[in-house]
Amino acid sequence: EEELQVIQPDKSVLVAAGETATLRCTATSLIPVGPIQWFRGAGPGRELIYNQKEGHFPRVTTVSDLTKRNNMDFSIRIGNITPADAGTYYCVKFRKGSPDDVEFKSGAGTELSVRAKPSAPVVSGPAARATPQHTVSFTCESHGFSPRDITLKWFKNGNELSDFQTNVDPVGESVSYSIHSTAKVVLTREDVHSQVICEVAHVTLQGDPLRGTANLSETIRVPPTLEVTQQPVRAENQVNVTCQVRKFYPQRLQLTWLENGNVSRTETASTVTENKDGTYNWMSWLLVNVSAHRDDVKLTCQVEHDGQPAVSKSHDLKVSAHPKEQGSNTAAENTGSNERNIY
């Protein structure tokens, strides 16, 4: 009679994570008598996957009844496959021996490859806010995918970005992989409503890529522009001065009025108006009693925006002149923080 052969007909098997792998094995003879065992890997470090007669293998089931007379089908199913199960599986025939059974013949092996989906990409931005014209970095991470081949793209408001660097780890063979990418984005004043998107495409996703997003509203700080103007007379000895705080983001803003360098009033922006681009405007009024001043008055609108150093704009009020409308001071625009002031 011809010597027993162990046949593993499949050189390779590809299974998606979470599914069941079927590893096929048949023997060509019933002799010698002895059990079949399945191993992952070869040599002394091999891992026992299934022993026909002994041991606990809750994830493994046999395709056929191994105790059936003349059974020569030793195929197994392994349930709930994970990337850690990848490797080459050998069906090995043992012959009964004393004290231990002796390995008789091995199949050629079946390579199990596991396809695992990447995790949802997580996009994170800088820890601190930055102002327009600055370049900020965003990172995108996704884990647990297999095989290693993967494509990552960055978008800002639907426009693909080109300034990014991507790494897939580890470099060598592994049961699963991770991707890490860093993109550089130049901020503009219009970016409050902008989004940065990281898009990951992988063979397991069947053409439906995964996306992670970050809102630039979490990253950007748009400093305000200040304008101080004197309004027409409201009463014989009173002048109304306004400080217009325009185009700022986020809303956190505190405004202080100073008369000749002395604090007159401090207020926090509350009732603001929102611009189409997502930035805010706010206006504060100061009613100045001219008769209380003998000399000219220097009025300063000082704004602290989002915890940044205060910026200010001043207006000179001439008390000698009749309190009629005067032009606005054209001091340089400065950043400030958004808050509403009521006298």
């Epitope: 026992l48 007669k53 002994e54 041991g55 004290p99």
Partner: antibody, heavy 113, light 108 residues
Framework: EVQLVQSGAEVKKPGATVKISCKVS????????MHWVQQAPGKGLEWMGR????????KYAPKFQGRVTITADTSTDTAYMELSSLRSEDTAVYYC??????WGQGTTVTVSS | EIVLTQSPATLSLSPGERATLSCSAS???????LYWYQQKPGQAPRLLIY???NLASGIPARFSGSGSGTDFTLTISSLEPEDFAVYYC?????????FGGGTKVEIK
């Protein structure tokens, strides 16, 4: 559900023989080896031997070789362990176990004159 | 025969503490063949860990196993009142099958 149900407690005189049964349900007894394990009072677990119910092949621990006989009846899905020439140190609980995950409830054997 | 030596013989700990039980083999045991059991008085052994590190069905995640070659460890991360029992390691890599002498985890 896999279950192994053993026969009841036994009291034997020194020199006698005891035969304990282990009936299985929830699987075919031919599927796995059936092991027998001894546990003397206050002591650890000691493997005695096993049978392959499919063909009756047995292996025994050197300590019990010659005194223990393990058999199986596949028609009733029952395994047996027979221990002869009993002595006082054989007073113990005897367990049957399969696939090293499922154990019988144990059978107490007391050897006393 | 492969002799399995467990240490310590007795471990006195309080609930909530971490328990580390050792099992040393006289010759190398493939990790696939090293199992751990828990046994309480009057009960049959209960499988806790199979193939060195795999949790048997219904066993809480506070139990974990590790090791390779000749040195294996069972860890209980935070002892619960029901964990006070005797623990055995077991090898079925070669004949005769053997068990360690056991470690009794008792309440301090």
């Amino acid at each position: 559900e896999v279950q192994l149900v053993q026969s009841g407690a036994e009291v034997k005189k020194p020199g006698a023989t005891v035969k304990i049964s282990c009936k299985v349900s929830g699987f075919n007894i031919k599927d796995y080896y059936m092991h027998w394990v001894q546990q003397a009072p206050g002591k650890g677990l000691e493997w005695m031997g096993r049978i392959d119910p499919e063909d009756g092949e047995t292996k025994y621990a050197p300590k019990f070789q010659g005194r223990v006989t393990i058999t199986a009846d596949t028609s009733t899905d029952t395994a047996y362990m027979e221990l002869s020439s009993l002595r006082s140190e054989d007073t113990a609980v005897y367990y049957c176990a399969t696939s090293w995950a499922y154990w019988g409830q144990g059978t107490t054997v007391t050897v006393s004159s | 025969e492969i002799v399995l030596t467990q240490s310590p013989a007795t471990l006195s700990l309080s609930p909530g503490e971490r328990a580390t039980l050792s099992c040393s083999a006289s010759s190398s045991v493939s990790s696939s063949y090293l199992y751990w059991y828990q046994q309480k008085p009057g009960q049959a052994p209960r499988l806790l860990i199979y193939s060195t590190s795999n949790l048997a069905s219904g066993i809480p995640a506070r139990f974990s196993g590790s090791g390779s070659g000749t040195d294996f460890t069972l860890t209980i991360s935070s002892l619960e009142p029901e964990d006070f029992a005797v623990y055995y390691c077991h090898q079925w890599s070669s004949y005769p099958r053997t068990f360690g002498g056991g470690t009794k985890v008792e309440i301090k």
